[in-house]
Each structure stands twice: as C-alpha cells, then as structure tokens.
C-alpha cells in the first residue's frame, strides 16, 4: 500500500488557447485530470487501473501552482494504491478549460481540452521527487512526482507491513526496509524477549523486563548464582538449592544439633575449662575453689573439713583457722592431750591405747569417721556423680540420680537411643536430642525402616514436567529424561522462557 504523489508546479499557455487552437473566452480557466495506470509501451486510453484524480480550477492561462496540502491535499495530488507497487507506471495529465462551475466530464464540451501529456517508465519507491517538464506547441507543464509507502508499509514495493509497538506483543520500531528494529533492552524475532541484567545466570535466572534478573525457585542474589538452603535448615549453607551443609560445630539432617556446645553457649563459669562430650553435652573442669556442674559454686576452704577431733573451722582471707576442743591442739587439732581414760571416742567408737597410754586411736562404727568418730560419713563430698548427676546419701552407701540422657553408677554413661540398633534392614540410626531418626536404604520405609517398599525408584514420580523416569536397577536410583524446554536432574527448571 502506498501513494503516487504528483506535484504540479507551473503551467504555461501564453496565448490562452485550446488544443484546437481556438482561444478561451475570456481566458482559459484551467484545471487538470490525472490518470495513473499500469505500464504500457505506448500509452493508450482506457481504464486508469492505478487511479484517477482531478483538481479544481488552479489558474487562468499561465500560472504557478502553490503547494497546498491543507485544502484536501490538492497539491501534491494523491493517488493511493493498496497493492504492491510494480515499479513501472503510465501517467496521463490533461489540462482542461472550465467555461462554468461544473467540472464533470459529461458537463464539458469535447473541445474544452487544452493539452494532454502521457509518460511511462520505471519508478522506485522513495522520498525523492522526480522533476519533469512536458512541452507542446502552445503549452508547457512543469511537475514532479514520486511514490511513497503508506503509514506502516515498507520495502522496495511497499509490500511489508510493519507497525511500531511497545507492548506485550513486541517492543520495536520499523526500519526503512520493513524489518523490525528492537527497542533498547529487547531481542527476539518480534522483540518480545527482554535482555536480562548482564551476568544473570542463564539457567537459574530469567527476566520479564530489560536489565532485570529474577531467580528460579531455589536461587537468590543479584545474578541468581547463589542457592537457597532447605526450608528446615538451621545452621547450614548450600551449593545447590535446598541443601543443608552444616556450619562448623553443627550436625544432623537440618544442622540443628549442637556439636560444639562449649563454643556456642560457654556454659562453664569462673574460668573453668569446657570439653564437648557429644551432642549438646559437655564437661566443666573447675579451677580450685569452685564446684558444681558448671563450676558455678564457690567452695569455702572449710568445706573440706580440715579440722580434726571436733575442731571448728573459721574461714579467713588467707585460708582458714581451726578452733580446737579441750584436750587437742595443732594446726588441724591433730594432737591430743587426752587418753582412753577421758572417753574421747564419740558415737559408740571404741578406744585403743597407744604408746603406753601416751595417746590413743578410736575405732569408729559404720557411718562415722574422724579421729574421735565425731563426723557422720558424707559419701558425697568427693562429688562422684558425673554429667551433672545429683549425689544422695543413703545410710552407709550413696547413689547418683542422673540427668536425662545419662546412666551408670556415676552417670558416666551417655544413653544412646541408637545403642539397641532400632533401625531395621540396614537403616542408619541418628541420635536426636529427644529421640532418634532412621535413614532407610532404598526399598524400605517407615519410622524404623520396617516397611518393605517397591525398590522402583520411579514409583514416587520424582521427575517433573511430564519427563520420562527410568530406574537404574543396579543402583536403585532414577534418571529423568527431560522433554524439550526443561533441564535439571528432575527436569525441574524451565529453559529460556520466564
């Protein structure tokens, strides 16, 4: 689709005569009829196959024709066509005299013709005007012409339709040949595909507008090259999406089991040394003068009962001091001025003379101790219970009450839920803080791997997007054969399309 444009510039008819030679009265009021048709070697009358157009009266005898595109497009004259421009044409221009106001052919006498010119030839589509001048015996016509394409038509023959757009269906302008020229940031046949942010990962990223980088599920970051750990992951990272690779000091499926309680919680007080002794368990080695599971209790120097023979102990800044009962002396009241005659043995202890009665020794009944049997036996003073166990005096013996997760006479044994091998069929047992978990081999399931399941790895439909699943019988694993447009071990990632 295009337009043949004819620009009339000047018509000369100095004598004001018709083609017959007869003069016009009072002068030749001149208008033009134009006929555009297919190429003919000899231009002959007949249908104007490419179109016709007429002008109003433009002047009398000789006149110049002004450019006038405002008044209905009078000059240049427009001859639109809605077909492919063939590149050749024939043009007939007739100048007529209008005696009255009616310019219709049937209203004019046949001899009202002033002049007639006919040309033919090749004409390429273009913006440039071709200037021509045709002279007859009495008249001269100067004009120019060209063929241009209609809006949205392009190419050598105006046959390529192209309408610039910037919407969901494309983002482009049209080149002179009708090819699309994508707007900045767009690509593809119809410029529908945005050009993502430079460096945006080809598989993991996509974009819906230029210079954007949106990540597919499981990926993050400006360029979608960083993975996202598993939803349940606590203290871990990943190298592929949904993994949970534990940070140092953490263990378990979701890295939620504390293997370095000492560092993470610093439970030991008063400068004690902390030793990790398993998942969430630890042992504090106290500095002198401190006791308790976390060395949180300060020991008095009198707590070790250093005063013998019933001496009473007094704490002092630089240590302690023993106040001895009558008949005793020395730093710890260890020396006696008594003999068996003084009945020095308490709580039913029996007295034995020594060194010819110069001193004595007491033999104590059960549950009593001390050089005079003055002390009740406390079997817990040595703090024999490990792992925070509580020591209880039970008459002549003692017992340890253990914290959950520990057992043994002295709570020295860590209770492992896995010790009794609860996972069937070769399942791997994991000790958890309050229970256990079995990781089952292929072909088994259930809390204890007790349920035999099909070892067809494809039974769980692991492949996405209608991919075909194949079982590798040698390894009980699956392989996904992806349909066109998807990648990944499970065909989970679409390719190319956002």
């Amino acid at each position: 689709s295009g337009v043949f444009q004819l620009q009339l510039q000047e018509f000369i008819n100095e004598r004001g005569v018709l083609a017959s030679g007869r003069p016009c009265e009072p002068g030749c009021r001149t208008f033009f009829r134009v006929c555009l048709k297919h190429f003919q070697a000899v231009v002959s009358p007949g249908p104007c196959t490419f179109g016709t157009v007429s002008t109003p009266v433009l002047g009398t005898n000789s006149f110049a024709v002004r450019d006038d595109s405002s008044g209905g497009g009078r000059n240049p004259l427009q001859l639109p066509f809605n077909f492919t421009w063939p590149g050749t044409f024939s043009l007939i221009i007739e100048a007529w005299h209008a005696p009255g106001d009616d310019l219709r052919p049937e209203a004019l006498p046949p001899d009202a013709l002033i002049s007639k010119i006919a040309i033919q030839g090749s004409l390429a589509v273009g913006q440039n005007w071709l200037l021509d001048e045709q002279t007859s015996t009495l008249t001269r016509l100067r004009y120019s012409y060209r063929v241009i394409c209609s809006d949205n038509y392009y190419g050598d023959n105006c046959s390529r339709l192209c309408k610039k757009r910037n919407d969901h269906f494309g983002h482009y302008v049209c080149q002179p040949d009708g090819n699309l020229s994508c707007l900045p940031g767009w690509t593809g046949e119809y410029c529908q595909q945005p050009i993502c942010l430079s460096g945006c990962h080809e598989q993991n990223g996509y974009c819906s507008k230029p210079a954007e980088c949106l990540c597919r599920p499981g990926w993050q970051g400006r360029l979608c090259n960083e993975c996202i750990p598993h939803n349940g992951c606590r203290h871990g990272t990943c190298s592929t999406p949904w993994q949970c690779t534990c940070d140092e000091g953490w263990g378990g499926l979701f890295c939620d089991q504390d293997l370095n309680y000492c560092t993470h919680h610093s439970p030991c007080k008063n400068g004690a040394t902390c030793s990790n002794s398993g998942q969430r368990s630890y042992t504090c080695t106290c500095r002198p003068g401190y006791t308790g599971v976390d060395c949180e209790l300060e020991l008095s120097e009198c707590d070790s009962n250093p005063c013998r023979n019933g001496g009473s102990c007094k704490d002092q800044e630089d240590g302690y001091h023993c106040l001895c009962p009558p008949g005793y002396y020395g730093l710890h009241c260890e020396h006696s001025t008594l003999s068996c005659a003084d009945s020095p043995c308490f709580n039913g202890g029996s007295c034995r003379e020594r060194n010819q009665g110069a001193n004595y020794a007491c033999e104590c009944p059960p549950n009593f101790t001390g050089s005079n049997c003055e002390k009740k036996v406390d079997r817990c003073t040595s703090n024999p219970c490990a792992n925070g166990g509580q020591c209880l005096n039970r008459g002549p013996s003692r017992m340890c009450r253990c914290r959950p997760g520990f057992t043994g006479t002295y709570c020295e044994l860590h209770v492992s839920d896995c010790a009794r091998n609860p996972c069937a069929h070769g399942g791997t047992c994991h000790d958890l803080e309050n229970g256990l978990m079995c990781t089952c081999p292929a072909g088994f399931s259930g809390r204890r791997c007790e349920v035999r399941t099909s070892i067809d790895a494809c039974a769980s439909s692991p492949c996405f997007n209608r991919a075909t699943c194949y079982t590798d019988l040698s390894t009980d694993t699956f392989v996904c054969n992806c349909p066109y447009g998807f990648v990944g071990s499970r065909c989970e990632f679409p390719v190319g399309l956002p």
Epitope: R216, G221, E226, I228, H235, N465
Partner: antibody, heavy 118, light 107 residues
Framework: EVQLVQSGTEVKKPGESLKISCKAS????????MAWVRQMPGKGLEWVAT????????YYRDSVKGQFTISRDNSFNTLFLQWSSLKASDTAMYYC???????????WGQGTMVTVSS | EIVMTQSPATLSVSPGERATLSCRAS??????LAWYQQKPGQAPRLLIY???NLADDVPARFSGSGSGTEFTLTISSLQSEDFAVYYC?????????FGQGTRLEIK
C-alpha cells in the same frame, strides 16, 4: 528453636517516618534470605519485599517500590523495614518471614501492627 | 502476575471428618506451591511446601497434592485445633502471590 521477634505496635500520622525490626535467633541468620509479608485489616496475605542473604539484593512489589526500604544487619541478626513517608494505605500487620520470593516462607515473626491515621 | 484462586471461601466440616481445600493458579506453576495455616491473632504457619512436602512438626493428617494449575490440601480427620484460615501461595513466578484464603469452620 527458630524465633523471629518483631518490634512493637506503631501508631503514626501520614507523612511520618518509621523503621520496624525483626530479631532472629535459632538459626544462622546470615545464611538465609528474608522477607516482609503484610496483611491489611480483614484481608489476606501480600508479599511486600525480599532481601537476599548472599549480596543483599532487594526486591519489592510494584505498588510499594520507592516507598519502603528493606535492609538487614547480619552482625545483629536483625531485619528492618523502613518508611520515609507513611500513608494511610500502609496500615497493616507486617510479618517478617524467612524465605525469598521464590521459596516458601518457612518461619514467621509474631507481626508488627502499623496504624497510620491523622 | 499469577492469580491464585481458593475455593470454597468458607468450608464447614464436623470434627473427625475429612476436609478438602482447593487452590487454582492462573498459569502453570509446576509444583512450586505452599499451604499456610493462620489462626486469629496469630502469624501464619507453613504446613506444606513443594505441593506435597510436610513442614517441620506438622501432623501427618495434613497432605497436599496436585501439579500445574490445580492443587488440593486435605485434612484427613479434623481436630479442634485445625479450624483456621488456610492460604495457598505460589513461588514459581515473580512476584509471589497468595490465594484469598479458605475459612475452615466447625459445622
């Protein structure tokens, strides 16, 4: 135990600024992307913004771009949401959550009610 | 953006019975769908992710199914603590979008 503890209720006037926070514990905060999700009174849930763990890249829903700022301080295990000029339409319960725009929101804070009224 | 449509808006079921909630996506989201439970005055809680994976500490009576554009949350035997609002959410396409919610109430 994973915990996301958010700052308290806020009542503000239009045009005022505001910064709410979300303190994380029980997981390695710097390893995970975080998000804000809001719920306008009597309405459903609406994703607002996301920040990556790796490089701090931020994303916002179109309707709030230029009005909110999401940020994080990994040294204090804290996520923030900031307004420079509040509008009445910002009135909502704002939840912080662990997750990105392309992953589930696995853990949620208790919510911060923001009321903007003249 | 992808529009998520949940149905029904309200579901009345008796305790002990089975409840089935539906969620439809306006375009294919593969299996990238999550379900959340929200009780009055509380934050949402993740129940299911990747269409059918149970989140931590979620009872086995909850299950999810579907793919592409049609998804279902099933609660096999309703307990009193299950009466709440349930939301589905897609995270396949940016931006992530939630359904408008289904209120599960005691019949």
């Amino acid at each position: 135990e994973v915990q996301l503890v958010q700052s308290g209720t806020e009542v503000k006037k239009p045009g005022e600024s505001l910064k709410i926070s979300c303190k994380a514990s029980g997981f390695t905060f710097s390893n995970f992307p975080m998000a804000w999700v809001r719920q306008m009174p009597g309405k459903g849930l609406e994703w607002v913004a996301t920040i990556s763990s790796s490089d701090g890249t931020t994303y916002y829903r179109d309707s709030v771009k230029g009005q909110f700022t999401i940020s994080r301080d990994n040294s204090f295990n804290t996520l923030f949401l900031q307004w420079s000029s509040l509008k009445a339409s910002d009135t909502a319960m704002y939840y912080c959550a662990r997750g990105y725009y392309n992953s589930p929101f696995a853990y949620w804070g208790q919510g911060t009610m923001v009321t903007v009224s003249s | 953006e992808i529009v998520m449509t949940q149905s029904p808006a309200t579901l009345s079921v008796s305790p002990g019975e089975r409840a089935t909630l539906s969620c439809r996506a306006s375009e294919d989201i593969y299996s990238n769908l999550a379900w959340y439970q929200q009780k009055p005055g509380q934050a949402p809680r993740l129940l299911i992710y990747d269409t059918n994976n149970l989140a931590d500490d979620v009872p086995a009576r909850f299950s999810g199914s579907g793919s592409g554009t049609e998804f279902t949350l099933t609660i096999s035997s309703l307990q009193s603590e299950d009466f709440a609002v349930y939301y589905c959410q897609q995270y396949n396409n940016y931006p992530p979008t939630f359904g408008q919610g289904t209120r599960l109430e005691i019949k």
